[in-house]
């Protein structure tokens, strides 16, 4: 049964050209996480992280992509075009899928809020 | 259009140490993918041994941990293989390869590496 | 380690024959497996990743399929140039494994 629960940094805003990070977080379950995958809005993968193999980065974005924090990602030199949704998709043993969401919002420089609690300044 | 191209000795004395050479052409060994050794044994079965990340990062068969390096030169474009305490059963055909989320998408043309005294 | 088991080791077909190949796997990899194609002398060609998605290039008579630990690779209207040995390898953990090959041969 599965009974882990995937907390997210939920819907974040970050400034165009600046960097931000996205994180989720498998809680209340023991299973062990084999591998993390980080997809975009539009269910490209941005990258891999496995238990055993380590991080892949999609070369695509291997120059604005960086592996971490954790099983994290940063998003570095934001475009407006990085408006949109992004998922983190965990596989587990013996639990199997989970999935989180996280919804971020590029803001023009002048008006962008420092609302993400995750966010690099 | 990126080529990978392997070299090295074809015959290694038990006990010594292999050495092989991937040259790539095409495309910068720094500058994404992975770059994997893999083998082709007389019988027909393929073995992966390990690979170097664009960044350096290295990742091995953990069968072969004890006795393999890979490493690159990146001023050459090229990345390498060495293999410790070589035994005849390390005889088989080396190719070099790019991976891409762990599968491999271009492949060298392989050379063979007989280990006899 | 992750165990490949390929069945058959080996098979005859002819020109214009449909011909599948299954990939057993010891432990669940979701969609992680690639299929590769070797001519004799020649080095492994990709056919297909993720299961099912044909690498470029790939003539449309190769489909992949299947998940966890039960995959196939089908050629519809097998051609001259399809004859060699097959391969299964899975990229879900530390070894890569790949299948011991099939063997496909003209009839």
């Known amino acids: 049964m599965m009974t882990g629960t995937i907390e997210t940094t939920g819907n974040i805003s970050a400034k165009k050209g600046g960097s931000v990070i996205l994180q989720c977080h498998l809680s209340s379950t023991m299973a062990q996480v084999t591998q993390v995958n980080w997809e975009q809005h539009d269910h490209s993968l941005l990258a891999i992280r496995n238990a055993e193999l380590g991080w892949h980065i999609y070369p695509a974005f291997k120059d604005r992509v960086a592996p971490g924090p954790g099983l994290g990602l940063t998003l570095q030199s934001l475009t407006m075009n990085d408006t949109g949704e992004y998922f983190c998709t965990y596989h587990t043993y013996p639990d199997g899928t989970y999935r989180g969401r996280i919804f971020l919002e590029v803001l023009e420089s002048s008006v962008a809020e420092h609302s993400a609690r995750f966010q690099i300044p | 259009d990126v080529q990978l191209q392997e070299s090295g000795p074809g015959l290694v004395k038990p006990s010594q140490s292999l050495s092989l050479t991937c040259t790539v052409t095409g495309y910068s060994i720094t500058s994404a993918y992975d770059w994997h050794w893999i083998r082709l044994f007389p019988g027909h079965i393929l073995e992966w041994m390990g690979y170097i990340s664009y960044s350096g990062n290295t990742i091995y068969n953990p069968s072969l941990k004890s006795r393999i390096s890979i490493t690159h030169d990146t001023s050459k474009n090229h990345f390498f293989l060495k293999l410790n305490s070589v035994t005849t059963e390390d005889t088989a055909t080396y190719y070099c390869?790019?991976?891409?989320?762990?599968?491999?998408?271009?492949w060298g043309a392989g050379t063979t590496v007989t280990v006899s005294s | 380690d992750i165990q490949m088991t390929q069945s058959p080791a080996s098979l005859s077909a002819s020109v214009g024959e449909t011909v599948t190949i299954t990939c057993r796997v010891s432990?669940?990899?979701?969609?992680?497996l690639a299929w590769y194609q070797q001519k004799q002398g020649k080095s492994p060609q990709l056919l297909v990743y993720n299961a099912k998605t044909l690498a470029e290039g790939v003539p449309s008579r190769f489909s992949g399929s299947g998940s966890g630990t039960q995959f196939s690779l089908k050629i519809n209207s097998l051609q001259p140039e399809d004859f060699g040995t097959y391969y299964c390898?899975?990229?879900?953990?530390?070894?890569?494994?790949f299948g011991a090959g099939t063997k496909v041969e003209l009839k």
């Open positions: 390869a790019r991976g891409s989320f762990w599968y491999f998408d271009v």
């Open positions: 390898q899975h990229n879900y953990g530390n070894p890569l494994t």
């Open positions: 432990e669940h990899i979701y969609n992680y």
